[in-house]
Each structure stands twice: as structure tokens, then as C-alpha cells.
């Protein structure tokens, strides 16, 4: 069986400020059974954007019905975007444990924010 | 019930240090971006210091940036502030102060710790 | 960096009149505007987000409007504890995060 494979299609996106920005995201294999999180960065100072398993994210909600057990779909929708939000996205697959760790991420989308027109 | 208590506070003199706790319970601590905002007395709001949610990412008011770290432990569910070289007006209650989303507001305050600075 | 400038600096309101608290920003922050409450020797307190969302367990008295750079804090029929200093915070650009200077609210 091949191995998980964290597929972001886009290596772009551009939001007008105060929009909703849609980051895509699927994975090839339900194995190895573990969460999604999204992060606008990497390394140590990444941030958290969305964990499909704890937390309260409101400006997120998943595009596809993600906690389906079959579900192989993670894209989001970041809502009322601001020049803050500029930057590159990762989906990241955990495999589950205690703690969860990390498996294999997507290669990014970055997130440029234009200005909102008048 | 979100809850944040902060300790640690206390007199000193300038230039030496002291680390102030803030205990944080009722939430996924470990989800969240937090912060350290002071007031000195009579004064407004100084926002200090913020933490993303995983450790590694810090960011510091002008003011006290080299002399103050920001630091978590999210195994402990605890925010540490290490206040070093401290100065007069450095003297002010510290709030900590939970972040609603990484790129938000704060919607949780804990009661405050005072510092005093004084010779 | 943007600055907040809140005016009045203090307000003096008769108990059931309405208090109205304006919060200007130097350049554009969107909907992206919270308002705190802070009574005397107490915490601050969440009252509205995003320009206009009041927070949990806030009385509808509290309403928030605006956008862009002009704020609008109201309080429809002041309460004698409403009375309190009033801080706008932007977060539409960060860091530094900032607060306004605050409003008083004072009962008459």
C-alpha cells in the first residue's frame, strides 16, 4: 500500500481583505489513522490555525464533513481575512498517539492578502 | 470555565528580576496564542508580550524587548513572563490575557499579579 | 503602527440614559475592533468583538458599531455597574497589539 501522501493543490491563493479564503487540502490514505492541523508558517513559530481533534477555531470551518470517518478531505475556510493572515498554509497529517506526532505535510499555499476595494 | 491565574508578583529593586506563573485551566491551552499586558497605576492598557501555541513564536513591546522572555509549558498548562533588569516603570499590574484565535483578540483576562520597582 | 484614540476621556451619564464611547483608529482596521471593559481594582472583561458581536454573557445594553477607522461603543440605558474605563483594542495589524487611552464612564 503507498504511503500517505498531504496533497495542497494550490501554491497560491489572494484574498481581498474582509473576504473568506479557501485553502484545499486532501490526503491519498485513511492509514495512519491520526488528526489534521492546519499552520500558517513552519518551524517553532508556526501558528496554529485549525486542529481537527481539540480547540475552538472560529474563524475556520471545514469545507468537507471532516470528523466522517471515511472523510479524506481537510480544505478550510479562514473567515474575514486581514493583512495578518498573509502567509503560507500547511496541512499537516498526525499520526495518532500519546501525544499525536506529526506524519507528513502538505507543501504549502501561500496566502496573499490584497486591499479591500472601495 | 476558562480560568487564568497569575502569581509571582512582588516588590523589587531596579535591575533584578522576577518571573511572574499565570495557571491557565477550562480550555485546550495548548491551542492557543496568550499574552502579557500590563497596567501601571493610573495608566491604560500596555499590551507586553504574546506566545504562539506551540512555544516557538514571541513577539515583544519596544519596551521590553531584551529584557523580558515569554515562555510556556503547555504539559502544565502554565504562561511564564521572566522580567529581567528591572526598571521603575516597569511597574505595573501583568495581566495574563488568553488569545481568542491566533489572530485575534483577547477574551480572557486573569486577575493580575503587581509588580513594584522601586529602590 | 496604528494608534486609537478614544474620546471622550470621561463621560458622565444619568442611570437609564444612553452613554455613547467613539474609538478612531489612524488608518483602516477593518471590522477587526474589540471593546473591554475594566471596573475599578478589577480585570478587564470581553465585551464586543469584530466591531459589532457582543461576547458571552454580555446584556444586549452593549452594542458596538463601525468600521474601518471610526468605532462607536453605546450603552443603551446606563447602569450604575456600567460604570467603568473603556478600552478599544485593534487587531487587524500586529504586533504590537494596541489599546485606546480610555473612557470613563462615569454615573451622575
Known amino acids: 500500500e503507498e504511503e500517505l501522501q498531504v496533497i495542497q493543490p494550490d501554491k497560491s491563493v489572494s484574498v481581498a481583505a474582509g473576504e473568506s479564503a479557501i485553502l484545499h487540502c486532501t490526503v491519498t490514505s485513511l492509514i495512519p489513522v491520526g488528526p489534521i492541523q492546519w499552520f500558517r508558517g513552519a518551524g517553532p513559530a508556526r501558528e496554529l490555525i485549525y486542529n481537527q481533534k481539540e480547540g475552538h477555531f472560529p474563524r475556520v470551518t471545514t469545507v468537507s464533513e471532516s470528523t466522517k470517518r471515511e472523510n479524506m478531505d481537510f480544505s478550510i475556510s479562514i473567515s474575514n481575512i486581514t493583512p495578518a493572515d498573509a502567509g503560507t498554509y500547511y496541512c499537516v497529517k498526525f499520526r495518532k498517539g500519546s501525544p499525536d506526532t506529526e506524519f507528513k505535510s502538505g507543501a504549502g499555499t501561500e496566502l496573499s492578502v490584497r486591499a479591500k476595494p472601495s | 470555565d476558562v480560568q487564568l491565574v497569575e502569581s509571582g508578583g512582588g516588590v523589587v529593586r531596579p535591575g533584578e528580576s522576577l518571573r511572574l506563573s499565570c495557571a491557565a485551566s477550562?480550555?485546550?491551552?495548548?491551542?492557543?496564542?496568550m499574552n502579557w499586558v500590563r497596567q501601571a497605576p493610573g495608566e491604560g492598557l500596555e499590551w507586553v508580550s504574546r506566545?504562539?501555541?506551540?512555544?516557538?513564536?514571541?513577539d515583544y513591546a519596544e519596551s521590553v524587548k531584551g529584557r523580558f522572555t515569554i515562555s510556556r509549558d503547555n504539559s502544565e498548562n502554565t504562561l511564564y513572563l521572566q522580567m529581567n533588569s528591572l526598571r521603575a516603570e516597569d511597574t505595573a499590574v501583568y495581566y495574563c490575557a488568553k488569545q481568542y484565535d491566533w489572530n485575534g483578540f483577547f477574551d480572557y483576562w486573569g486577575l493580575g499579579a503587581l509588580v513594584t520597582v522601586s529602590s | 503602527e496604528t494608534v486609537l484614540t478614544q474620546s471622550p476621556a470621561t463621560l458622565s451619564v444619568s442611570p437609564g440614559e444612553r452613554a455613547t464611547l467613539s474609538c478612531r483608529a489612524s488608518?483602516?482596521?477593518?471590522?477587526?475592533l474589540a471593546w473591554h471593559q475594566q471596573k475599578p481594582g478589577q480585570a478587564p472583561r470581553l465585551l464586543i468583538y469584530?466591531?459589532?458581536r457582543r461576547a458571552t454573557g454580555i446584556p444586549d445594553r452593549f452594542s458596538g458599531s463601525g468600521s474601518g477607522t471610526d468605532f462607536t461603543l453605546t450603552i443603551s440605558s446606563l447602569q450604575t455597574e456600567d460604570s467603568a474605563v473603556y478600552y478599544c483594542?485593534?487587531?487587524?495589524?500586529?504586533?504590537?497589539?494596541?489599546f485606546g487611552g480610555g473612557t470613563k464612564v462615569e454615573i451622575k
Open positions: 488608518q483602516t482596521v477593518g471590522s477587526k
Open positions: 477550562g480550555f485546550s491551552f495548548s491551542s492557543y496564542a
Open positions: 506566545i504562539n501555541s506551540g512555544g516557538g513564536g514571541t
Open positions: 469584530d466591531a459589532s
Open positions: 483594542q485593534q487587531y487587524y495589524y500586529w504586533p504590537p497589539y494596541r
